[in-house]
């Protein structure tokens, strides 16, 4: 007796295929151990066609996979394109050798099925309609027509010439000739059901001279899409229903038990599981649309069916398609944090992840957005300029290469929460949603500069200071010049950095800019940021202004702009943000949105496409010098 | 209203055989997986057989202790289901449940991957 355990006969059709799932004992070594799938022969050999080691035999190239499911102690063998040539006895088994655990499972594969020669035979999909063909004698042109349907004893009347209509057809059913044609008439019937499939009699005429036509009515429901996601990686359903279906609320729903519950519609309504990771996209005027779902879960696999009905709801009798979503475990997208904290006047550093080997992609962020279909606006990007309304308080950090770019947002505010995506043009799978949380603040910030009324005197040197704690210290210090382009690093040294220090002294830690002399050019946000090497943390924001000295007095008021710009993290944040071992504001890849939102969010990413690197530390120069000095008081 | 109707059950000697039959009413979808499981007095309810179909592809499942000697069938469409039973044993004693799906997924030994159940119908094997 096998403790492995899957379906003992197979049965198909040439050119279909199959998904054979085979169970194993819930252990450590049978999870990490090699599965296979083979032959087995007249001897009592079992000749491996493919198994988890990457293996493929020449006959199951390029229409087989298996893909092991450790999270649900099963693996799983697809093979497309049957012949009769596959039909045979197989095993599925764990173990180095085939002689390993195994089940045995058969599989045959038939001839399509032939009907008798005069039989016309119509394959439907669910919701579709078919129209028969019926023809006749001339002779019998003035006679009655009808369709009826086979029943054990008698055929059931689905339809006639004389406007007579069974009740389980009304509605659906119509019986017309096409022009001047008097040799055949035509019976339509809409919204199919699995309860219209059967054998139906359609005839002209009574008696002897009666024209006969057997019909065969195949209603099929549309054969699951197998469709494989890693964890935290994203799906899109393409669900494509037809022309006629192009003006009624599309939707997608997941099978649970005996109903579909509705996930999304285009009427508005959405599972609160999925809020800030779906898109629904109308494609075109044909009935096609998309469905986006990222930041895929453990708990997202099942089976969905998209389909249309004005009611936004599944309807028998409308036309659906189905998919089978199967979430791997072991997956490549590594796992981050996927909420996000924040204070008021704080910042966030938020770690986006991108697949290593598209390290040229052009990278953004948006911002998730729930009303109507919901939709994605880019609010930064690579090649994107930073929206106007995120002036001087964002920015995209590209570190080419190590799979991580980072978008830093400051002067938090309670209207900044929500979920935000990290996104490229390139490997869509890894699109990664972080919800973003913004508490009031309690505490002082970490970082703050000063003079906090950054006026900037034309021609004279002006220093900004930018107090930190010391836990601190260690880190890497910089001031960048904030555009719109990204936040320019200024070259530094930080020279007390170098100097040993066994105490700390919390009130004098500072690292300053100085602009000598102010330029014109100088005008604008600047950002007093730490991090530990690729590793962005804590910021603060400030805008200094230039003005030409006047008489009397070399400082003016302070600009309104400036009334944000004290920024900084709650310290526990700070410190996760920063340290290595706890990444608590580096986001994991959460939810997400849809394949023609993601275009237009390429789209809008094309028109705001601007020269110059956004975010990288050689992407523009500065005229002004600027120096970091660490004071020790 | 949903309703799994079985019939076939009875008395027979051991050695004999039965023929189960099950028909599904009121279903919200074409089943897409049926399956029988016996329950013993005073025992928890067990997976027999089962059948589940993607398309035009049909899945036979059994328990280890019926291979060989029971075989199950079923009609997707018309969504019924029969059992087959030989060579029947006093062990086989028991009130056989018929059970329906929506798809074809998840492991089909466990009862709490099937919605739908019928009334059951007892089989009772004696000399």
């Known amino acids: 007796k096998s403790p492995i355990f899957g379906p003992q006969e197979v049965s198909s059709i040439e050119g279909d295929s199959v998904s054979i799932t085979c169970y194993y004992p819930d252990t450590s070594v049978n999870r990490h151990t090699r599965k296979y799938w083979c032959r087995q022969g007249a001897s009592g050999m079992c000749t491996t066609l493919i198994s988890s080691n990457g293996y493929l035999s020449k006959e199951y190239s390029g229409r087989a996979n298996l893909i092991n499911f450790p999270e649900n102690n099963t693996f799983v063998i697809n093979i497309e394109q049957l012949t009769q040539d596959d039909t045979g006895s197989y095993k599925c088994g764990l173990g180095t050798s085939n002689r390993g655990l195994s089940f045995d499972v058969s599989l045959e594969v038939s001839q399509v099925p032939e009907l008798p020669s005069d039989t016309h035979v119509y394959t439907k999909d669910i919701g579709r309609n078919v129209t028969i063909e019926c023809p006749f004698k001339r002779e019998n042109a003035p006679s009655k027509k009808s369709l009826c349907k086979k029943t054990n004893q008698s055929c059931e009347l689905v339809i006639d010439s004389t406007e007579k209509v069974n009740p389980s057809y009304i509605g659906r059913a119509k019986l017309f000739m096409k022009g001047t044609d008097l040799t055949v008439f035509y019976v339509n019937i809409s919204h199919l059901t699995h309860n219209d499939a059967g054998l139906y009699i359609c005839q002209a005429g009574e008696g002897p001279s009666a024209d006969k036509k057997n019909v065969d009515l195949q209603v099929l429901a549309p054969e699951p899409e197998l469709l494989y996601k890693d964890l935290r990686s994203s799906v899109t359903f393409e669900c494509d229903l037809g022309r006629e279906v192009a003006n009624e609320a599309k939707y997608l729903c997941r099978m649970n038990k005996e109903t579909c519950d509705v996930i999304i519609n285009t009427l508005g309504k959405r599972d609160p599981d999925f809020e800030g990771r779906i898109l629904i996209t109308p494609k075109d005027d044909n009935g096609r649309f998309s469905v986006l779902i990222t930041g895929l879960r453990k708990e997202d696999a099942g089976h969905y069916q998209c389909g249309a009905h004005s009611s936004g709801l599944p309807q028998e009798g409308w036309p659906i398609q189905t998919w089978q979503l199967f979430v791997n475990e072991e997956s490549t997208i590594p796992n981050r944090r996927s909420v996000v904290k924040g204070v008021t006047g704080g910042s966030v550093a938020i770690a986006c992840p991108y697949n290593p080997k598209e390290s040229s992609s052009l990278k953004y962020w948006c911002r998730w957005e729930g009303d109507g279909n919901g939709h994605c606006p880019v609010l930064v990007g690579t090649q994107a300029q930073v929206q106007e309304e995120y002036e001087g308080r964002l920015a995209l950090f590209d570190q080419p290469g190590n799979g991580t770019y980072t978008v830093i947002l400051n002067q938090l505010t309670t209207e900044d929460a929500g979920f935000y995506w990290c996104l490229t043009n390139g490997d869509s799978r890894w699109r990664t949603t972080i919800e973003l949380q913004v508490a009031e603040a309690t505490r002082e910030p970490n970082l703050e500069v000063t003079p906090q009324n950054a006026t900037a005197v034309l021609g004279e040197t002006f220093t900004v200071s930018c107090h930190y704690p010391c836990k601190f210290y260690s880190q890497e210090k910089y001031w960048c010049k904030w555009s719109n382009k990204g936040c320019h690093i200024l070259p530094s040294h930080d020279e007390g950095a170098r100097q040993s220090s066994v105490s700390c002294d919390q009130s004098s830690q500072l690292v300053s800019m100085t602009l000598n002399p102010v330029s014109k050019e100088d005008e604008g946000w600047y950002w007093c940021g730490v991090k530990q090497g690729q590793t962005y943390g804590e910021t603060t924001a400030i805008y200094i202004a230039v003005e030409e000295r006047t008489r009397g007095s070399s400082h003016v008021n302070p600009t309104d702009a400036n009334a944000r710009a004290k920024v900084a993290l709650e310290e526990e944040v700070v410190d996760s943000s920063i340290s290595e071992k706890e990444n608590k504001a580096i986001p994991n890849p959460g939810p997400f949105a849809n394949e023609r939102e993601i275009q237009n969010v390429g789209d809008q990413a094309q028109e705001n496409r601007a020269s110059g690197d956004a975010g990288s530390a050689d992407g523009q120069s500065r005229s002004s010098s600027s120096k970091h000095h660490h004071h020790h008081h | 209203q949903v309703q799994l109707v079985e019939s076939g059950g009875g008395l027979v000697q051991p050695g004999g055989s039965l023929r189960l039959s099950c028909v599904a009413s009121g279903l919200p979808f074409s089943s897409s997986r049926m399956a029988w499981f016996a329950q013993a007095p005073g025992k928890e309810r067990e997976f027999v057989a089962a059948i589940g179909w993607r398309g035009r592809t049909s899945y036979k499942y059994y328990a280890d202790s019926v291979k060989g000697r029971f075989t199950v069938s079923g009609d997707n469409a018309k969504k019924t289901l029969d059992l087959q039973m030989k060579d029947l044993k006093p062990e086989d004693t028991a009130l056989y449940f018929c059970?329906?799906?929506?798809?074809?997924?998840?492991?089909?030994?466990?009862?709490?991957?099937?919605?739908?159940w019928g009334q059951g119908t007892q089989v009772t094997v004696s000399s």
């Open positions: 059970a329906a799906h929506p798809n074809d997924d998840g492991d089909p030994r466990i009862s709490g991957n099937y919605q739908y």
